[in-house]
Each structure stands twice: as structure tokens, then as C-alpha cells.
Interface confidence: low
């Protein structure tokens, strides 16, 4: 007769690890017992269980309460166990020892492997502007056992780089990704791709992209200086810009106060119907967390009665 | 994930107006600006306006100054836009769609169709 | 205003190469994004900035823009690639967003 078993079991943490070994026999022979150890290199032979043909299962001190019997049906000449609850430290060589009769002992060795499947964390870096230059946009560090593999996925450019702590029983694999913040980067997913032998699927964490800027202001509504004349109605400048975060506006005057019955809406700098008080310099302020932009432009009421043409200045300042 | 959840058809008479809802989840509302599209029956693609969800302040197309009025709720992450003196051209599904700064749209609204009919 | 004109309709044969172009005066200078838009259904995007794709948009997708006018191509096309296609820029000067008038491709 011969020994069936496997030369490597495979357990994820915290499951049950049947550890096989069956003797395929000619007719009429018989198992005594299987006895199991554990025999790593270096150190004595570890008692596990003993599973006898009459009094059944014996399980040694160390391992009560851990090692069982497969449940039944069960064939006499199985001497397959079951370890419960596996932990890393079971990880190792274990050795089934068959006595049979009339045809002696046989052995066989197989190795339990433990996979710790990783809890992944993603770590964003330092807040990401426009204009820095090679920047951590986020680190992933993974322990498990063996080392889980650490990769990125996204429609970014830029530059990863890994590095790994071996522990005893596991490793840690941390791998961050760096790139040249731009707004075009604004709401794009960076995902960390773990993968792990111990992991059904890829584990996936997504960090969304945030890069601050802030674009230069400028002001519309002074396009045709003509308009701008005594009596009209519904005149208006609107300042421009974007950003992220989106910013908030906010008008003033240079040379004064703004003239009763300005409207400020936001972007939006609303006059009632024009008079001379309403010339002056005016300065849109754009602003978010990141930065802040002005924007200055000179309104010059026309007087009808008057011949002479005015000039229309436009500065911008950040 | 990213969602923007419309609110139901509508069936408005002429010079009635309407207001169309679009919630947002799965993102930063305050975030992302959010565009309003049209589509006639059988037209193509038609911008109204943008909404800055933070701070409000809006900017619409030329064609609907006047008639559109688009604004937001921070503590629901929804936005509205509501378009007043409908007529009969009007009838169209509406979109809200999440602008990126650029400016594209890559989600969009499942859409709402508003039938303004006599 | 801002003008963007598309072919009305384009026709290919399944496994060759469809172009729709697009043309509006020195488009090349702005950033041109395609979408695409089947019956009963919202649009999706599929070319952004000219000529990348979002996650989840085959290879066959590709943009190009220069001049007065930006392409989009699809290879290899596909029966399911059938729907109406639309460019749309960002109008600085107008501050207004602006479509193409679309462009039904037929697939023979």
C-alpha cells in the first residue's frame, strides 16, 4: 500500500486546515493508527494527535480543543485531521505516521501554509497645489504573509516606488505614488491594487485627486465703453476665474466705498441706473483656500453732454 | 460611487414654470461644479448654465438669461434648476451633469423630460 | 458665439475605422471632449482634453485636434459602437459651454 497526502496545504488565517493523509491499501489490510506531528527543521517532533483505530481521536495538550476528526462519513483507512482556527504559528512541516497491519508503518510529510490575507491602509500625502513640484499624492502599506504585492491604478502620470519590512512571520510592503500636481488631475482616482495569494479578489482602495489652484481673475462687462453712460439700466461686471476648491467673490472699491444701491451677487456686480458717482476703480477679489487673484477695472460714466471719448483701463493683479 | 439622481417627468402648460432637482452622492458635492443640458426631441445637446455648488453663483447661457434660474442645497448635495415662461420649444429632457474643470461632463443625470404642452 | 460643426451622419462597415470630425475657427487652440449618446440614454464621455480616455473606454477611442478642426476615431468598429456623437468645447471668451450638433454613426 502507499501514502496519499499533499505536499502543501493551503490556509487562509482563522480557517480549518485539513491536513490529508490516506492509506490506499491492498484488501484486507487495516490502519492501527496515524499518528501527527509536527517536525520543523531544527526541532524535536511535536506531538499533535493520535487517532486510533478503537479509542479514536487523542489530541495532545498543546493542541485541545483544536484538532479534530473530518466529519463522517469516514472511511477506516483515512487518518486525515483537522486543525482549527489556524494561526501563523502553525505554519510548518507536519508528518503522518501510518501503522498498518500486516504491512508496517508508513510516513508521509506535507507543509501547512498560513496566509495572512493584508488589511491595506492608503494614506493621502500633504495637500496637493498647482505649481509644486514632484509631490507624495499617497502612500499604501500592506502586511501579510507572504509579502501581498502593492500596485497602483490610475490614469495619472507619475513616478511609484516600494519598499518592504520583513517580520518574522510577514511583511510589510509600502509603495508610494508621487506626481507633478495639475488641475487637469482634479476628482481623478488613484486606487492602491492589492493582491495576495490570501484574497479572493484585488483589494482596492481609492483616493480621489485634489489639486488647488486657483486661475487668474479677470472682468467682463466693460467691453464697449459706450454703454456705460448716464441713465443706463441693468449694468453689470461679472469677474472670472475658476478653482479648486471653486472660489467665492468678493467686490470692493479702490477709491471709496461702493455707491449705495450696488448689488453684489457673488461673481456678479449689479448697478442701478448709472451716474457719475458710479466711476471709479473696481476691484473683483477671487479667493479659495489655496490662493487669491484680484482683478481691477476703471468704469468711467459718460456724460451725453459731453463730447470727449474715455479711455477703458483694465489691470489684473494676482 | 458617483450618482446624480433626477427628479421625475413633468408636464408644465405654456408661461407655467418648472424645477427640475438632481441629487448628488458618492463625491465631495461641494467639490465639483455642476452644468445643466438640454435635448430637444431628436435635437442635439444643448448647454444652459453652470452652478458653483459652493459658493452659489451661477452662470447660464446667453439663450436663457432671464429665464433660468439654477441653485443649490449644501445639506442635501442637490441642485435645481428651474426655467420659467415655458413654451412649447421648451419640451426637452433636461440634464444636470458634473462639470470638470476643463470643462467636461463625466457623469451625468439619468435626465428628465419636461413636456410643456397645452 | 462659438461655433462647432459636425457631420451630420457617418457610415462604416463593421472593422474599419470611423472619423468624425469636428470644425470651428482655431479649435486646435481649445480643449475639445467627445461624448457618446445612444437611444433613450444620457450621454457618456469617452474622449476628454483632445485625445485621453476615461477608465473604462476601450483603445478603439482616440482624439486628435489641431487647426480648425478635431477628429474623433474609432477602430475597429463595433455594431454597439453605433449612436450619435457629440464634440463640446469651452468658449472662454463667452464664458459658455458649446456642442456640436451631433453625429449619427451608422454602422453598415
Known amino acids: 500500500g502507499e501514502l496519499e497526502t499533499s505536499d502543501v496545504v493551503t490556509v487562509v488565517l482563522g480557517q480549518d486546515a485539513k491536513l490529508p493523509c490516506f492509506y490506499r491499501g491492498d484488501s484486507g489490510e487495516q490502519v492501527g493508527q496515524v499518528a501527527w506531528a509536527r517536525v520543523d527543521a531544527g526541532e524535536g517532533a511535536q506531538e499533535l494527535a493520535l487517532l486510533h483505530s478503537k479509542y479514536g481521536l487523542h489530541v495532545s495538550p498543546a493542541y485541545e480543543g483544536r484538532v479534530e476528526q473530518p466529519p463522517p462519513p469516514r472511511n477506516p483507512l483515512d487518518g486525515s485531521v483537522l486543525l482549527r482556527n489556524a494561526v501563523q504559528a502553525d505554519e510548518g512541516e507536519y508528518e503522518c505516521r501510518v501503522s498498518t497491519f500486516p504491512a508496517g508503518s508508513f510516513q508521509a510529510r506535507l507543509r501547512l501554509r498560513v496566509l495572512v490575507p493584508p488589511l491595506p491602509s492608503l494614506n493621502p500625502g500633504p495637500a496637493l497645489e498647482e505649481g509644486q513640484g514632484l509631490t507624495l499624492a499617497a502612500s499604501c502599506t500592506a502586511e501579510g504573509s507572504p509579502a501581498p504585492s502593492v500596485t497602483w491604478d490610475t490614469e495619472v502620470k507619475g513616478t511609484t516606488s516600494s519598499r518592504s519590512f520583513k517580520h518574522s512571520r510577514s511583511a510589510a510592503v509600502t509603495s508610494e505614488f508621487h506626481l507633478v500636481p495639475s488641475r487637469s488631475m482634479n476628482g481623478q482616482p488613484l486606487t492602491c491594487v492589492v493582491s495576495h495569494p490570501g484574497l479572493l479578489q484585488d483589494q482596492r482602495i481609492t483616493h480621489i485627486l485634489h489639486v488647488s489652484f486657483l486661475a487668474e481673475a479677470s472682468v467682463r462687462g466693460l467691453e464697449d465703453q459706450n454703454l456705460w453712460h448716464i441713465g443706463r439700466e441693468g449694468a453689470m461686471l461679472k469677474c472670472l476665474s475658476e478653482g479648486q476648491p471653486p472660489p467665492s467673490y468678493n467686490w470692493t472699491r479702490l477709491d471709496g466705498p461702493l455707491p449705495s444701491g450696488v448689488r453684489v451677487d457673488g461673481d456678479t456686480l449689479g448697478f442701478p441706473p448709472l451716474t457719475t458717482e458710479h466711476s471709479g476703480i473696481y476691484v473683483c477679489h477671487v479667493s479659495n483656500e489655496f490662493s487669491s487673484r484680484d482683478s481691477q477695472v476703471t468704469v468711467d460714466v459718460l456724460d451725453p453732454q459731453e463730447d470727449s471719448g474715455k479711455q477703458v483701463d483694465l489691470v489684473s493683479a494676482s | 460611487q458617483v450618482q446624480l439622481v433626477q427628479s421625475g417627468a413633468e408636464v408644465k402648460k405654456p408661461g407655467a414654470s418648472v424645477k427640475v432637482s438632481c441629487k448628488a452622492s458618492?463625491?465631495?458635492?461641494?467639490?465639483?461644479?455642476m452644468h445643466w443640458v438640454r435635448q430637444a426631441p431628436g435635437q442635439g445637446l444643448e448647454w444652459m448654465g453652470i452652478i458653483n455648488p459652493s459658493g452659489g453663483s451661477t452662470t447660464y447661457a446667453q439663450k436663457f438669461q432671464g429665464r433660468v434660474t439654477m441653485t443649490r442645497d449644501t445639506s442635501t448635495s442637490t441642485v435645481y434648476m428651474e426655467l420659467s415662461s415655458l413654451r412649447s420649444e421648451d419640451t426637452a429632457v433636461y440634464y444636470c451633469a458634473r462639470g470638470r474643470l476643463g470643462t467636461y461632463f463625466d457623469y451625468w443625470g439619468q435626465g428628465t423630460l419636461v413636456t410643456v404642452s397645452s | 458665439s462659438y461655433v462647432l460643426t459636425q457631420p451630420p451622419s457617418v457610415s462604416v462597415a463593421p472593422g474599419q475605422t470611423a472619423r468624425i470630425t469636428c470644425g470651428g475657427n482655431?479649435?486646435?487652440?481649445?480643449?475639445v471632449h467627445w461624448y457618446q449618446q445612444k437611444p433613450g440614454q444620457a450621454p457618456v464621455l469617452v474622449v476628454y482634453d483632445d485625445s485621453d480616455r476615461p477608465s473604462g473606454i476601450p483603445e478603439r477611442f482616440s482624439g486628435s485636434n489641431s487647426g480648425n478642426t478635431a477628429t474623433l476615431t474609432i477602430s475597429r468598429v463595433e455594431a454597439g459602437d453605433e449612436a450619435d456623437y457629440y464634440c463640446q468645447v469651452w468658449d472662454r471668451s463667452s464664458d459658455q459651454v458649446v456642442f456640436g450638433g451631433g453625429t449619427k454613426l451608422t454602422v453598415l
Open positions: 458618492g463625491y465631495t458635492f461641494t467639490g465639483y461644479y
Open positions: 482655431n479649435i486646435g487652440s481649445k480643449s
